[in-house]
Amino acid sequence: TQNKALPENVKYGIVLDAGSSHTSLYIYKWPAEKENDTGVVHQVEECRVKGPGISKFVQKVNEIGIYLTDCMERAREVIPRSQHQETPVYLGATAGMRLLRMESEELADRVLDVVERSLSNYPFDFQGARIITGQEEGAYGWITINYLLGKFSQKTRWFSIVPYETNNQETFGALDLGGASTQVTFVPQNQTIESPDNALQFRLYGKDYNVYTHSFLCYGKDQALWQKLAKDIQVASNEILRDPCFHPGYKKVVNVSDLYKTPCTKRFEMTLPFQQFEIQGIGNYQQCHQSILELFNTSYCPYSQCAFNGIFLPPLQGDFGAFSAFYFVMKFLNLTSEKVSQEKVTEMMKKFCAQPWEEIKTSYAGVKEKYLSEYCFSGTYILSLLLQGYHFTADSWEHIHFIGKIQGSDAGWTLGYMLNLTNMIPAEQPLSTPLSHSTYV
């Protein structure tokens, strides 16, 4: 007689990443009996919600339910019905909602209440929606990549199971770029973290970690572009802005009201003699780079050393995983290879930005023009941020690994967030039961 397969004893969890530009739903799965083991949780699905970020629904909250439907229904299909009631659902909102809250706490609360109402009506164990702090976003991103890279495992291996693994227990730093903020998180080498706000202490799997983290609000790629436009239009002689960060021949009309809508441009706000202006691309990497550098105030530092805007940054240490928009942008530009030096990246960016807009549109016919038009800026911004903002050099560039997925799971804060909220990262090293790592029973 045939042996009947035992039912899979697995658990699921759902995390929604409500970012500034869009929302993504992630479904995670793990063996129920191995909850405390490192590296057992993996992503089984990612569903990108169609539409903008939740902060854009502030004037149309009644549309939030429909907006979330497709991905929540997908979760219903992927997760077995018998597991629905036990599957936790978490929603974390990031910098887009931080900015909305700065403008109006009442409006931010209304959006979150309606998001919660929509998510509560699914048969999962919904645990609530909240705006996570920049510090949490950095910390959870760091936990995610190191968990997936096996850095918390005490078992030394003679073989490498994941890319980038140098087979030591040195953790990777985490570089996260979103639309509205960017995070840098790493363990400095024997360096005191001079500002308490940037210091985190963790005990994970029996080991202590002193971690540095900072989230730069308004320095995500979308908000950085708004900042740059607001800064540059101040000195424009008329309603034409000749912009080196866009391809030659590119034209776009921008409403001044849209430019000043975000708190990120408040410092550049002024009364302009026009309601609209036209961006005209001139495609010059060097000038674009120079314009971006003006967003970073490096003249003031109350610590031994700073990133920019007076924010403490210890000397960089070890390898770094650069993910989210760092990865998406560099992947589009074909610059994620470990073999591409920083000098080569700069050369490629110079060539790319100089390409005429019509040529670019033809070469990338399948890409939405809104996104396509911004890769020159985004690529240049990434280089400026990493080199001048965080002080990477041509030599240390090789320590940056542009990562999309590790072991099939997206690099980002969501997995770390779920691991923390489901208590799946123990402070102490779990005791191995005799059978827990055996090949067969």
Partner: antibody
Framework: QVQLKESGPSLVQPSQSLSITCTVS????????VHWVRQSPGKGLEWLGV???????DYNAAFMSRLSITKDNSKSQVFFKMNSLQADDTAIYYC?????????????WGQGTTLTVSS | DIVMTQSHKFMSTSVGDRVSVTCKAS??????VAWYQQKPGQSPKALIY???YRYSGVPDRFTGSGSGTDFTLTISNVQSEDLAEYFC?????????FGTGTKLEIK
């Protein structure tokens, strides 16, 4: 254990207003929403409105112009106020807890407060 | 507004029998339907949500089914304590609406 208890007048004159307080225990108003539902022999169960955990409200459009729901988290109380009452507002008024954080279905109901609108 | 119709005002059954209470929505509500039990002189008690998910503590003789516009609450092996009125409720869109109720009588 979870409990909700409505307290309010049993008789109100036509055109007057109604105020009911729902006092909750066993859960926090910062974690769950509270709905209001009424029941009458003529109209059955009617949903009136909800206050969600951060304080935003939604009302049944049929009652919106004369209804207000507020709360005091520290006192674990939700306040229901309806203006311009008429005879057909005679009903049992219930407060009910959202089953999940902010869901639109209810796992616990108060015992109800019976209201008669009459001169 | 979505109208929830419970066509049977009363249903008569015997202890040990199986009975099905039906509810029809005037438009598609997916599976956003809950069922409540109300005993005479008491407030409603939650039984089922999302059309077919039972609350913990609710006896497994209560089963919900259906999606779209047609929903059923089935009570198998009816007990005398099941004498009550049963209401369906849709929460697919505002305003939330309830069925007119079905009174279960024990023969």
């Amino acid at each position: 254990q979870v409990q909700l208890k409505e307290s309010g007048p049993s008789l109100v004159q036509p055109s007057q207003s109604l105020s009911i307080t729902c006092t909750v225990s066993g859960f926090s108003l910062t974690n769950y929403g509270v709905h209001w539902v009424r029941q009458s022999p003529g109209k059955g169960l009617e949903w009136l409105g909800v206050i969600l955990r951060r304080g935003s409200t939604d009302y049944n459009a049929a009652f919106m112009s004369r209804l207000s729901i507020t709360k005091d988290n520290s006192k674990s109380q939700v306040f229901f106020k309806m203006n311009s009452l008429q005879a057909d507002d005679t009903a049992i008024y219930y407060c009910a807890k959202t089953a999940v954080v902010a869901g639109d279905y209810f796992d616990y109901w108060g015992q109800g407060t019976t209201l008669t609108v009459s001169s | 507004d979505i109208v929830m119709t419970q066509s049977h005002k009363f249903m008569s059954t015997s202890v040990g029998d199986r009975v099905s209470v039906t509810c029809k929505a005037s438009q598609n509500v997916g599976t956003n339907v809950a069922w409540y039990q109300q005993k005479p002189g008491q407030s409603p008690k939650a039984l089922i949500y999302s059309a077919s998910y039972r609350y913990s503590g609710v006896p497994d003789r209560f089963t919900g089914s259906g999606s779209g516009t047609d929903f059923t609450l089935t009570i198998s092996n009816v007990q005398s304590e099941d004498l009550a009125e049963y209401f369906c409720q849709q929460y697919n869109s505002y305003p939330l609406t309830f069925g007119t109720g079905t009174k279960l009588e024990i023969k």
